[in-house]
């Protein structure tokens, strides 16, 4: 079942094959270098989707920058396929599923003076299920409330305060949000969760609620990158991959992240009896993408050089802010009860073939289905 997932994996949600750049991992590295000691959390599929949506209204070099930045080298024919691919993906992701909460969406808030092209608005709605809202940015407090209330409503209160402040000179603000909470295929036993040490650095220890479960997991030791990788399946199609770098090797692992690495991990997984200890945590990442994407070659759209003639007839329109927020909760809940009792584990002699894997220092996580839904680094749960 993991092999099937490898074959179906569209890394970075790029539905077209010819790629010169590893968008997902380049973006990760850009975020990591901007804040080395911070946790990182974002949704490559969600950001790719909002950029592809933006490309609908972009022309000439602006469009080319977006598509190339995403790692795509498209002919006219495959551009249609790209948007159709995202449309299909969105429909799949938004399908209600048991034990699986996913709210993913895009919206465009535009100044009252901006007249949007009907073709763009309808393509946005049809292909990307995206909303557009006229907004009075002169009243920045009111505009911020409008945007935050909209996202809070769409995520049933799971994402609040998307924007912390707002420039009253804004003309176009793109928001992109994703919230995810799913049940594990097999739950962690609540009674096995207890406070444990988490080494933020070798000197800084914090206490975290540490979940535990002994089970068969997809596991591998990557000697090249000096890390251990474990796959924990969610109900349905998604799997969480947790990557524990050896001490002092986080940067080495980060530098080695690529589509090829991920495919290799998914292919090389072997079932292994593990005593797994994983912090219970909620992680979120909030990013002003207009500050980060230029380092990936996507810059025009945020400057006066933007060609967004497909969005509006206004000649001087540009995207003022592109805000992305991703939130995931990790707890014990599963669809199947764990086969554990009130004791944490049996005595060690009874499980000599079991290896202990403790996520008690900064680690990386992916959530994948056929795409990379999320990618993050947990520095401090």
């Amino acid at each position: 079942e993991m092999k099937k997932r490898v074959e179906d994996l569209h890394v970075g949600a790029t539905v077209a094959p010819s790629s010169r750049r590893d968008f997902t991992f380049d973006l990760y590295r850009a975020l990591a270098s901007a804040a080395p000691s911070q946790s990182i959390f974002f949704s490559p599929v969600s950001i790719s989707m909002s950029l592809a949506m933006l490309s609908l209204g972009a022309g000439s070099s602006t469009k080319m920058q977006i598509l190339e930045g995403l790692g795509l080298n498209l002919q006219k024919s495959s551009e249609k396929e790209l948007h159709r691919g995202f449309q299909q993906l969105l429909q799949e992701l938004n399908q209600p599923r048991d034990g699986f909460q996913l709210s993913l969406g895009n919206a465009l808030f535009t100044d009252l003076v901006v007249d949007l092209q009907d073709t763009f608005v309808s393509a946005m709605k049809t292909l990307y299920l995206a909303d557009t809202f006229p907004t009075n940015f002169r009243d920045s407090a009111g505009a911020m409330k409008q945007i935050n209330d909209y996202v809070a409503k769409q995520t049933k209160g799971k994402i609040v305060d998307l924007l912390k402040n707002l420039d009253s000179n804004a003309v176009v603000i793109m928001v992109n949000y994703i919230f995810f909470k799913a049940k594990w295929e097999t739950s962690f036993n609540h009674k096995g969760t207890q406070e444990q040490d988490f080494y933020v650095t070798s000197e800084t220890v914090v206490r975290v609620p540490m979940m535990s479960r002994e089970d068969q997991y997809h596991y591998l030791l990557d000697r090249n990158l000096s890390c251990r990788v474990v796959g924990v399946p969610y109900q349905g199609n998604a799997t969480a991959l947790f990557i524990l770098p050896s001490e002092g090797k986080m940067q080495q692992v980060e530098n080695g992240l690529s589509e090829k690495t991920l495919r290799k991990w998914l292919k090389m997984f072997k079932k292994r009896q593990l005593e797994l200890y994983l912090p219970k945590f909620s992680i979120e990442g909030s990013y002003q993408l207009e500050k980060v994407l230029p380092s990936l070659g996507i810059s025009n759209v945020f400057t006066s050089h933007a060609d967004l003639s497909g969005i509006s007839n206004h000649s001087n329109i540009q995207v003022s802010e592109m805000v992305h927020k991703a939130v995931v909760e990790v707890d014990e809940s599963g669809t199947r009860a764990a086969a554990a009792t009130g004791t944490i584990f049996t005595f060690r002699s009874a499980r000599l073939n079991s290896q202990r894997l403790v996520f008690n220092r900064p680690f990386l996580m992916f959530i994948v289905d056929n795409n990379i839904l999320f990618l993050g680094k947990v520095n401090r749960p």
Epitope: K191, T193, Q194, E195, Q196, D197, V205, V206, R207, V208, P209, M210, S212, E275, Y277, T343, I344, F345, F347, R348, R356, V358
Partner: antibody, heavy 119, light 106 residues
């Protein structure tokens, strides 16, 4: 069966040092933590500190820093608590208690060692 | 460091009576833990992670709470429950104990 056997009572002079032992059976201390707790006569419990034998990391309550040193010998499966510059305030029963990932922390305690500091 | 304030310091209850001991913390905790200690014996883990009963603890005991406010409850007091009860936090270093509640039988 998990057991923690502590060394016998100690009568020591003020200013001296004492080293208490806690020998584990039924498990390897190298996979665990060991906590030490102080209880003065007719008083409550005070956490002194703990050692993580996996990486050697120790943590102490600041008020015991410099007074207490927690160590261990994995070959003899024994944890140690050394107390220095003893005063009458150090007269108490000292307990070791097991911690770790695969057990409930503080589910297993030694029987305690009474240390009496007297001239 | 987190200070735990237990109350009452001492109390007595008749057999069959409901007993509640409270413990409040100066900072929010992940969990609270409770120990029972009888004279001349080592403390015993009684309730762990706020609400889970340790092995062998009678079902008349329960624990609850969140944030900074926690309690241990005995639904119907029995003679064998007479002991001193301590709350403990392990949410941050240094770990700390409450000053104890001595529970006597009337």
């Amino acid at each position: 069966e998990v057991q923690l056997q502590q060394s016998g009572a100690e009568l020591v002079k003020p200013g001296a040092s004492v080293k208490l032992s806690c020998t584990a059976s039924g498990f390897d201390i190298k996979d665990t933590f060991m906590h030490w707790v102080k209880q003065r006569p007719e008083q409550g419990l005070e956490w002194i500190g703990r050692i993580d034998y996996v990486n050697g990391n120790t943590k102490y309550d600041p008020k015991f820093q410099g007074k207490a040193t927690i160590t261990g010998d994995t070959s003899s499966n024994t944890a140690y608590l050394q107390l220095s510059s003893l005063t009458s305030e150090d007269t108490a029963v000292y307990y070791c208690a097991r911690g770790g990932y695969d057990v409930r922390e503080f589910a297993y305690w030694g029987q305690g060692t009474l240390v009496t500091v007297s001239a | 460091q987190i200070v735990l304030t237990q109350s009452p310091a001492i109390m007595s209850a008749s057999p069959g009576e409901k007993v509640t001991i409270t413990c409040s913390a100066t900072s929010s905790l992940i969990y609270m833990h409770w120990f029972q200690q009888k004279p001349g014996s080592s403390p015993e883990l009684w309730i762990y992670s706020t609400s889970n009963l340790a092995s062998g603890v009678p079902a008349r005991f329960s624990g609850s709470g969140s944030g900074t406010s926690y309690s241990l409850t005995i639904s119907r007091m029995e003679a064998e429950d007479a002991a001193t009860y301590y709350c403990q936090q392990r949410s941050s270093y240094p770990f700390t104990f409450g000053s104890g509640t001595k529970l006597e039988i009337k």
